[in-house]
């Protein structure tokens, strides 16, 4: 199987690979098309050693615009020609493909959390998928970002071991009867763009300024 | 047949940058990632670094952060390298290599950087 | 990073008869997807590297059977079975398996 033709006509998709909650999700968005698919699926093979074409199960006639792909793509070294089939009915309106490598590729997704503001501090909750494959962790590191008036300040939590299991953070030294937004994102190692958390905020309850955090827990 | 063909040599003073580029041919170009490795007399090959032609993510050698600045231009099929604040030890010949995964499969001809006062 | 050792500097060889290169990383290049990411390249005088082996021991497309890879963890080779003289050049050795990538230093074959 040849993957070099020298046609290529101007992709009617626009994949994005990215992981969320840890899971290798992949999306697409269809560019200029006049007949939307009824349903969708995802086929794919290794680079390396080019076989037939794999139908993703889980992507096999699929009304979703994404598929989870966690289970089927476990290398982060290998190349994945994926092919999307787009349908109306029985027909085939439209084929994309895009090779896919996991490690200059991927995107991260911030993780979930919460946040509850004290007197003057505030406890972060990130919550992470209680098991993580290794090759998932992507030598990423945990940010988060506290907002108040104007001033940003970086918070880089050390978390020992995996990202797995929920984590807590605690943002001390902080103000009572002020506004702050919290949001969170994962940092790779490289100059990656980040995908930073929507803000959530809190104002913190009135009281004393001396007051620790450790009693106010 | 795949080609990777790359600018001229270059003959710069210290203190300023150089870009020189990589364009590749006869494949689909944001099928494939682009590497960037160094071949200097003092340290044979070296590799610099990789970029996604399609997202434009890239991944460092943490030696040539800072000196090295890789981009792509998709409409020409085009991947970028801009070395900075040059050196007498960044003369060097300077390789474009495509890959597929880990797999380095196509080398283009070499650009020749010479940095003299 | 990984340090990658090759033996010998050059490598004087008759034409027709065997040569061997070894290549020592400073850690094991076997993936946790069960895959070793050591690969060869030739370089001949003048021309950009072409890559001759990946994963250890697949040769390339048009690379000749007279080339063997062989070798697991640490240690690998390279051999020539019978040395023709479009061999000459400078072989490297190279690891994939963790970034940042590394080559070897070189061997020179070179033809008696």
């Known amino acids: 199987i040849s993957y070099d033709s020298p046609d290529y006509t101007d992709e009617s998709c626009t994949f994005k690979i990215s992981l969320r909650n840890f899971r290798s999700i992949l999306s697409w968005e269809l560019k200029n098309h006049s007949i939307v698919p009824t349903h969708y699926t995802l086929l794919y093979t290794i680079m390396s050693k080019p076989e037939d074409l794999k139908v993703v199960k889980n992507c096999a006639n699929t009304t979703r615009s994404f598929c989870d792909l966690t289970d089927e793509w476990r290398s982060t070294h290998e190349a994945y020609v994926t092919v999307l089939e787009g349908f109306s009915g029985n027909t085939t309106l439209f084929s994309c493909s895009h090779n896919f490598w996991l490690a200059i590729d991927m995107s991260f997704e911030p993780p979930e959390f919460e946040i509850v503001g004290f007197t003057n501090h505030i406890n972060v909750m990130v919550k992470f998928p209680s098991i993580v494959e290794e090759e998932l962790q992507f030598d990423l590191s945990l940010v988060i970002e506290e907002q108040s008036e104007g001033i940003v300040k970086k918070h880089k939590p050390e978390i020992k071991g995996n990202m797995s299991g929920n984590f807590t953070y605690i943002i001390d030294k902080l103000i009572p009867n002020t506004n702050y937004c919290v949001s969170v994102y994962l940092e790779h190692s490289d100059e990656q763009a980040v995908i930073k958390s929507p803000l959530k905020c809190t104002l913190l309850p009135p009281g004393q300024e001396s007051e620790s955090a450790e009693s106010a827990k | 047949q795949v080609q990777l063909q790359q600018s001229g040599p270059e003959l710069v003073r210290p203190g300023v940058s150089v870009k020189i580029s990589c364009k590749g041919s006869?494949?689909?170009?944001?099928?494939?990632?682009m590497h960037w490795v160094k071949q200097s007399h003092a340290k044979s090959l070296e590799w610099i670094g990789v970029i996604s032609t399609y997202y434009g993510n890239v991944k460092y050698n943490q030696k040539f952060k800072g000196k090295a600045t890789m981009t792509v231009d998709k409409s020409s099929s085009t991947a970028y390298m801009e070395l900075a604040r040059l050196t007498s030890e960044d003369s060097a010949v300077y390789y474009c290599?495509?890959?597929?995964?880990?797999?380095?499969?196509?080398w283009g001809q070499g650009t020749s950087v010479t940095v003299s006062s | 990073d990984i340090v990658m050792t090759q033996t010998p500097l050059t490598l004087s060889v008759t034409i027709g008869q065997p040569a061997s290169i070894s290549c020592k990383s400073s850690q094991s290049l076997l993936d946790s997807d069960g895959k070793t990411y050591l690969n060869w390249l030739l370089q001949r005088p003048g021309q950009s590297p072409k890559r001759l082996i990946y994963l250890v021991s697949k040769l390339d497309s048009g690379v000749p059977d007279r080339f063997t890879g062989s070798g697991s963890g640490t240690d690998f080779t390279l051999k020539i079975s019978r040395v023709e003289a479009e061999d000459l050049g400078v072989y490297y050795c190279w690891q994939g398996t963790h970034f940042p990538y590394t080559f070897g230093g070189g061997t020179k074959l070179e033809i008696k």
């Open positions: 006869s494949y689909k170009f944001t099928d494939y990632a």
């Open positions: 290599a495509r890959s597929s995964g880990s797999y380095l499969d196509y």
